[in-house]
Interface confidence: medium
């Protein structure tokens, strides 16, 4: 969380923006919330990048003001109009890129004065695993299988029974380029599986973290999986 | 009314450094992006930096990389361009000119220069 | 970094006539061009932007076109006050840069 206050000049406001990230190709938000103020016409909200002259996204006189933006950003911002004037300043930010990633600045006057703060915003791809027993193979095997990551990522397995095992000699794992030559298809597999086990692949780069669980009974497959940014510190 | 004002003439010394600076007036300051351009006598513009004020870092033509600074000062709303090293082919006008139309990318508001002139 | 060329290097016009000068990018710039107009002594002047745009408080006698690599500014009725050298500018690619500029005269 990063909170800012304001500039010299007029009375400083609170800013607070938290770090985030953004999954390629989809939608991202940019988080940012200030003190709000009783008229919507007195709030200008400017979106800056580090390095970009232009800007990112402006809302005053509760409208977009897009005149002034960037070209890499044209088109693909969006603030939450209706909750402007409760004090919600974040950036919805369509189709995300990996050039998206950077320092942003969310800055925001009201009639009560200024203040900005940064936001870290980095790129990449995540995207669930999702673990399978694989019954092509000669003996019992999982196949965990992720569509979609970058960086590229680590795969460790992980079981209950046998916690703190090293499973790196019994597994194989993968990745394939996908078609827009950015992102990879993660897929790992795990040899000698036992029965009445859970087993957990575990994918992880510096962006995401996701683990992908499946338990493997006479019975009945249970499967369950969650993914977690890494990122999210507020400022 | 925004308004570009720059400051005077110098004449300065081969191997020394000048700091021109750009009050803007009559608007935002912060988040408008500032860029300098220089243009030697007779000769066409030359684009070296440009500047964020809120953000403070600069970005810089490579040719002028190592040898120009662009700073910003908020409280004063002044933008300035250090050159150091200076050699007589860097006697030029120098200007100062803020980004506006589509996406700042065109530079809408010119400051009216400052010649400096480079002479032992 | 992209190159821009500006034809001719100086331009004869007799007031009233119509002038034509062009700007060409070494590489695509699409529309992202500029053009400047400058007098003796004085600081350019935004004239037209996105390669067909005219900026505030510019006469409709200047028009702009083409994208990619070529361009035109077009001064369909030169006035005596259009006697200056003009610079068209790309800022598709930073550094955004300008060409030599062209110099329109009285005939």
């Known amino acids: 969380l990063i909170i800012g206050f304001g500039i010299s000049g007029r009375h400083s406001i609170t800013v607070t923006t938290v770090a985030s990230a953004g999954n390629i190709g989809e939608d991202g938000i940019l988080s940012c919330t200030f003190e709000p103020d009783i008229k919507l016409s007195d709030i200008v909200i400017q979106w800056l990048k580090e390095g970009v002259l232009g800007l990112v996204h402006e809302f005053k006189e509760g409208k977009d003001e897009l005149s002034e933006q960037d070209e890499m950003f044209r088109g693909r911002t969006a603030v939450f109009a209706d909750q402007v004037i409760v004090g919600n300043a974040s950036l919805r930010l369509k189709n995300v890129q990996l050039t998206d990633a950077g320092t942003y600045k969310c800055y925001i006057i009201t009639s009560k004065g200024k203040g900005n703060a940064n936001l870290e915003y980095k790129t990449g791809a995540f995207s669930m695993p999702e673990v399978n027993v694989d019954y092509n193979a000669s003996s019992e095997t999982l196949r965990c299988e992720a569509p979609r990551w970058f960086p590229q990522p680590t795969v460790v397995w992980a079981s209950q029974v046998d916690q703190g095992a090293n499973f790196s000699e019994v597994s194989n794992t993968s990745f394939e380029l996908n078609s827009e030559n950015v992102t990879m298809k993660v897929v790992s597999v795990l040899y000698n599986v036992t029965i009445n086990n859970t087993y957990s692949c575990m994918i992880e780069n510096d962006i995401a973290k996701a683990t992908g669980d499946i338990k493997v009974t006479e019975s009945e497959i249970k499967r369950r999986s969650h993914l977690q940014l890494l990122n999210s510190k507020a400022s | 009314q925004v308004q570009l004002v720059q400051s005077g003439a110098e004449v300065k010394k081969p191997g020394s450094s000048v700091k021109v600076s750009c009050k803007a007036s009559g608007g935002t300051f912060s988040s408008y992006a500032i860029s300098w351009v220089r243009q030697a006598p007779g000769q066409g513009l030359e684009w070296m930096g440009g500047i964020i004020p809120i953000f403070g870092t600069a970005s810089y033509a490579q040719k002028f990389q190592g040898r120009v600074t662009i700073t910003a000062d908020e409280s004063t709303s002044t933008a300035y361009m250090e050159l150091s090293s200076l050699r007589s082919e860097d006697t030029a006008v120098y200007y100062c000119?803020?980004?506006?139309?589509?996406?700042?990318?065109?530079?809408?508001?010119w400051g009216r220069g400052t010649l400096v002139t480079v002479s032992s | 970094e992209i190159v821009m060329t500006q034809s001719p290097a100086t331009l004869s016009v007799s007031p009233g006539e119509r002038a034509t000068l062009s700007c060409r990018a070494s590489q695509s710039v699409s529309s992202n061009l500029a053009w400047y107009q400058q007098k003796p002594g004085q600081a350019p002047r935004l004239l037209i932007y996105s390669a067909s745009t005219r900026a505030t408080g510019i006469p409709a006698r200047f028009s702009g076109s083409g994208s990619g690599t070529e361009f035109t500014l077009t001064i369909s009725s030169l006035q005596s006050e259009d006697f200056a050298v003009y610079y068209c500018q790309q800022v598709n690619v930073w550094p955004p840069t300008f060409g030599g500029g062209t110099k329109v005269e009285i005939k």
């Open positions: 000119a803020r980004q506006q139309y589509d996406g700042r990318r065109y530079f809408g508001l």
